[in-house]
Amino acid sequence: DWVVAPISVPENGKGPFPQRLNQLKSNKDRDTKIFYSITGPGADSPPEGVFAVEKETGWLLLNKPLDREEIAKYELFGHAVSENGASVEDPMNISIIVTDQNDHKPKFTQDTFRGSVLEGVLPGTSVMQVTATDEDDAIYTYNGVVAYSIHSQEPKDPHDLMFTIHRSTGTISVISSGLDREKVPEYTLTIQATDMDGDGSTTTAVAVVEILDANDNAPMFDPQKYEAHVPENAVGHEVQRLTVTDLDAPNSPAWRATYLIMGGDDGDHFTITTHPESNQGILTTRKGLDFEAKNQHTLYVEVTNEAPFVLKLPTSTATIVVHVEDVNEAPVFVPPSKVVEVQEGIPTGEPVCVYTAEDPDKENQKISYRILRDPAGWLAMDPDSGQVTAVGTLDREDEQFVRNNIYEVMVLAMDNGSPPTTGTGTLLLTLIDVNDHGPVPEPRQITICNQSPVRQVLNITDKDLSPHTSPFQAQLTDDSDIYWTAEVNEEGDTVVLSLKKFLKQDTYDVHLSLSDHGNKEQLTVIRATVCDCHGHVETCPGPWKGG
């Protein structure tokens, strides 16, 4: 029959060439002379001339060694024709399978592989995967089957076998406990890939395993005891810098310190922060310390990390003895702002109040007093006793110096320390009203017609406070009542002035006496301009000129 079984040819054959492989034979050769030919890639198309056929015998020839890794299978067609060139058979499929030889070593995909694993992990933890390829056949033979192994490990601490490798997948895993970044931060493994499933050619590469940091070291105070001196009353004052050492990776959350005042700060006087670069604990005062109340504080500070510990670790504690230094403190007026009620207009030399200060210092320091600010110059202060007396007339109605009935004075106390310190106090004198102002009308100039005059309404004001104000009473004096009338309205806060007799055009003085509810009387002269006119007028018209 015109058929041929698949032909297997080993790659890398040594010849001699041409090498006879198989004979093509048509049973039509009994009837006529047959000529054989082959076509296809490897025969008459690229790669041309690898195979040929003896035209008359039908022997299939191999002309050169084959390379399976280049072409693993050739598909050719055999042809049989008679002398006249007529085809005597259908084209026959010829399959030539190139069988593998182990002519390639494994190759790692990288010269150096890099992986990482957390320190302190359990055996069995995967680290990384390495890969090697082999061009040889791994399906029908072991030529391309790669087996991985670890040849060596550096350093060999704490065990010479810290890692193992899956022989088929190349996955590197931890096999021994004891990975400690602080002792060995990196391992270098020489890895091997061997074909023939471990029995053939070997190639090597390097796997570098970085050991990642875990928070397995507690920060430790160094030193653990501190003594510091702080002046009393200082706020935000740096008391002490506390130093810690931590074996974990610098500037990582496992290294960065977190400080906590565990005891000794009952009054919440202190605070502690972490310096971002040095990792030191900066102890500062949150509030001023008081030497007189407590001259020594013993603080207990604990340090941990930003990251939690991965295992149970003892925490380090520091003891800080803070000595509070005495400072000459300023005297403090008690109260800092003192309100005193005093009648306005009290006689000169009359006592107003005693305003004294206390010195926080325990020494019996002498305090002297003086007035610092007395805008109207109404007061004096005894330097020894703090007695404040009137030396001017206290006037509640003085709008320049008195606001809302209050006259504000600043006083100063000075101790005899070295150097001396001063403290100030505010004396707020609430001036009690006295009926020392009579009522006054507004306006004090009026213009009125001498015929059918309009009544003039004047507002009455009194600088005093109730009850030394309305209702007011009005009275005309000095014969002003011959031509004029003055009446207070029902509310008692305005006076109505009326012209009751004819007066020729001129300017007149109207003598008006107003008294308040406390009978304080005030005489006011109203300048009245009388005009020759009827009814309402604002200014007198000029003299009438006839034509």
Epitope: V121, P123, P158, H159, L161, T169, L311
Partner: antibody, heavy 117, light 111 residues
């Protein structure tokens, strides 16, 4: 000579607690992972729990997860197994074993835990 | 169900050789050369007989030997003696947790 000595076993009622200890000597304790393996009467070996040399990593079998706690004190060369909410199926001999050179060796002599009402 | 498969029992006469098999997968026995064999006498703790497939710890008789082919490991005891009668367990390293898998155990009877 490397030695492991377990203690703390005994009879306990279901729901009760026990704490097993394993005292180690003859090797650098903190450099090795340690394990607890148990063997129920007439049965095979079952891995219960393991802990890394530093104590930072632990493993528990699903059958004991949430009930047992493994710990170690490297300053005392001692391994512990705190067993809470004990059940009848936890009845077994409990062995501690050192993991090194790719194997469990040596094993302690074992301590018997019986959970019964 | 154990991860590694062992025959439940084997037996042999004194002086004979016996082999106990331990079959795993390509991710344990087949992947790593960390197969161990333990001997356990009744009421006693397991004792390591073979580590790393074929290494004998000091003090273990050279009658005990180990080997591995593919996913199956074997323990061979030659010149069987009465004191060899015990339970034998195999174990293998595997990546992941737990990192050790055990066989179900084989009871060796010396006839």
């Amino acid at each position: 000579e490397v030695q492991l000595l377990e203690s703390g076993g005994g009879l306990v009622q279901p729901g009760g607690s026990l704490r097993l200890s394993c005292a180690a000597s003859g090797f650098t304790f903190s450099s090795y992972a340690m394990s607890w393996v148990r063997q129920a009467p007439g049965k095979g070996l079952e891995w219960v729990s393991a802990i890394s040399g530093s104590g930072g990593s632990t493993y528990y079998a699903d059958s004991v997860k949430g009930r047992f706690t493994i710990s170690r004190d490297n300053s005392k060369n001692t391994l512990y197994l705190q067993m809470n909410s004990l059940r009848a199926e936890d009845t077994a001999v409990y062995y501690c074993a050192k993991w090194g050179d790719g194997t469990l060796n040596p094993w302690g002599q074992g301590t018997m835990v019986t959970v019964s009402s | 169900q154990s991860a590694l498969t062992q025959p439940a029992s084997v037996s042999g006469s004194p002086g004979q050789s016996i082999t106990i098999s331990c079959t795993g997968t390509s991710n344990d026995v087949g992947a790593y050369n960390y197969v161990s064999w333990y001997q356990q006498h009744p009421g006693k703790a397991p004792k390591l007989m073979i580590s790393e497939v074929n290494k004998r710890p000091s003090g273990v008789s050279n009658r005990f030997s180990g080997s591995k082919s593919g996913n199956t490991a074997s323990l061979t005891i030659s010149g069987l003696q009465a004191e060899d009668e015990a339970d034998y367990y195999c174990s293998s390293f595997t990546s992941g947790l737990p990192w050790v898998v055990f066989g179900g155990g084989t009871k060796l009877t010396v006839l």
